[in-house]
Every structure is written in C-alpha cells, then in structure tokens.
Interface confidence: low
C-alpha cells in the first residue's frame, strides 16, 4: 500500500519490511508481454533485486524493465521469447531484514 511508504520524518525511526502477497505464476505466449509483481512494503524504502534462475535480471532498454508501483515492483518483459521462461524471484531488503518471493513464467 502507498501509505506504507508515505511516512513523515517523525515516524522514520520505525523500520519494517513486509511481503504483502506471494508472486503469481504466469503463463503466456511468444511475442506477448508478461508482468510479474513483487508486492512488498517497508521503511526505509526496500532495495529490490530481481533474479531469474538465481542469476540477477539485467534490464534491457525497451524490452525488459522493472519499475515502482503502488504495491512494490513490477517486472515487465515485452516480446516474449522461449528463453524468457524460468523461475523469477524478487528479493527485498530494508538494510536489516530480507524477504523474497518466487514465481514461474512459462
């Protein structure tokens, strides 16, 4: 939720990190667009990394990117290829705690 990040300076000493919802598995077709959603909230704002089959996901301009959403992070892959299938994991940390969630794209 947006409110979890919109915290005034008086409350910033209260740190937390929450996985708000597990990641969904995705089934789609070649050439289509897939979106995976990492639903986390925290304070300080969590640093989020995406992994595919345990390797860091590298953004590809105009094809593969991850961006902030009101609920956490969205990984978008355009023009899907067979090589895009695999296990996707998001890992979030606020510097003190770590949470993660895994979904399958196939």
């Amino acid at each position: 939720p947006t409110s979890s990040w919109n915290i005034s300076s008086e409350l910033n000493k209260d740190s937390y990190l929450t996985l708000d919802e597990p990641m969904n598995n995705i089934t789609t077709s070649l050439g289509q667009t897939a979106e995976l959603h990492c639903k986390v909230s925290g304070n300080p704002p969590p640093t989020i990394r995406w992994f595919k089959n345990d390797a860091p996901v590298v953004q590809e301009p105009r094809r593969l990117s991850f961006r902030s959403t009101i609920y956490g992070s969205r990984l978008r892959i355009r023009n899907l290829d067979t090589t895009d299938t695999g296990y996707f994991q998001c890992v979030a940390t606020n510097g003190k705690e770590v949470v993660s969630s895994t979904g399958v794209l196939f």
Partner: antibody, heavy 121, light 107 residues
Amino acid sequence: EVQLVESGGGLVQPGGSLRLSCAASGFTFSWYGIHWVRQAPGKGLEWVAYIDSYTSSTYYADSVKGRFTISADTSKNTAYLQMNSLRAEDTAVYYCARSHFGHYDYVMDYWGQGTLVTVSS
Amino acid sequence: DIQMTQSPSSLSASVGDRVTITCRASQSVSSAVAWYQQKPGKAPKLLIYSASSLYSGVPSRFSGSRSGTDFTLTISSLQPEDFATYYCQQAYDQLYTFGQGTKVEIK
C-alpha cells in the same frame, strides 16, 4: 555515514579526455547503483550516466553516448566516468549520486559535492 | 524520449505561503518520479520518490502527488530554508530525465 567524494575535474581542451572518480563509503557498494549528473553554469540538472555495479549494466544520455564510459571497481568502492572527445558544452559541475537498485534505480538519495570540468581552449 | 515539462520556471512567495510546482510528462512514467531541492553551490537533496513518498528526514510540509501524467510538489507552509530551486525527475526505459527546475524566491 554514507559519503560520496568526486575527484578528477579540471581544465581540458576541446577534444581532450578526463576521468572522474567517485569514491564511496559507508554502505555496501555492490548493492547500489551510481549515477553521474551534471550541471552547466547557471543551468539545470542533466542526467549523464548510470551503472548498477552488481550486474554491470550501464545506461547513458544520448548527449554523451559513444563519448563517455561509466564503470565501477567494487574492490575499491569507486565509480568512474571516462570522458573522451570533450566539447565546450560538456563544461559543468559533475555530481555522482547513489541510487537504490531495481525499481528505485532513479532515486538518488546521496550526492557528492561535485567536481568542476571546464572544456576550453 | 520522455520530456518532463516543469512549471513555473520561477515564483515569488512569502514565508507561510502554500507553494505548488508541477511537472508534466510527455507520456506515462508509472510512479517513477522524484523531486529534489537544490541550494546555490550545493548538491541536490532528495525530497520525494515514487511520486508521493516522503524521503526519510524530509519535513512533512513537503508532499507529492500524481494525476495522470501530471506530478505535483506542494510545500504546505513555506519556511525560510525552503527558498531554493526544485527539480522533478522521471525514469523510463533506463533514461532518467530532470525537469528544467523551479526557482522559489522570496517575495
């Protein structure tokens, strides 16, 4: 305490080269990205380049693509900006800034003090 | 590429005034928008990220909002230390663009 310290600025002739350094301390360098942002005298901020030192992904503004190269040495906790074929319009204060990785890669939460690059004959 | 059109380029205001600065994106940029404050001779400071999230340690008189492709920074009650230049910034497809800046001056 998070600190970013730029160095390497100075006076260079058009067509010349310069390498800027950004020494980082107070955080786990490989878990963050580094941006270079410049500001010409009396002008606004212009994003120049970004590196995610974890994956070595690099991105550039069109105005510097092919002339500037951003890199990072995680063993030294330092990012670099190699500037070649410098032009008068590259004259600016160059800042390095830390960003979170991933969907917060644009959020520049700590900045250095800046280093001045002057391109003039 | 996306352009961020920031307005006004400058404004004069008094202590206690409510100040609003707007950035319009040339196309949708999700919520990947930040706002920075810069004082003369100093590096910028982060105020707002994700369009509306207040950065740690920033006074609560600063707030951000989004309506479509319009992003707004509001200072609810201007303080003497708030006279500065403010920049919006967006991220889209690994390009990170700043607005032209808004200079807030003393009336």
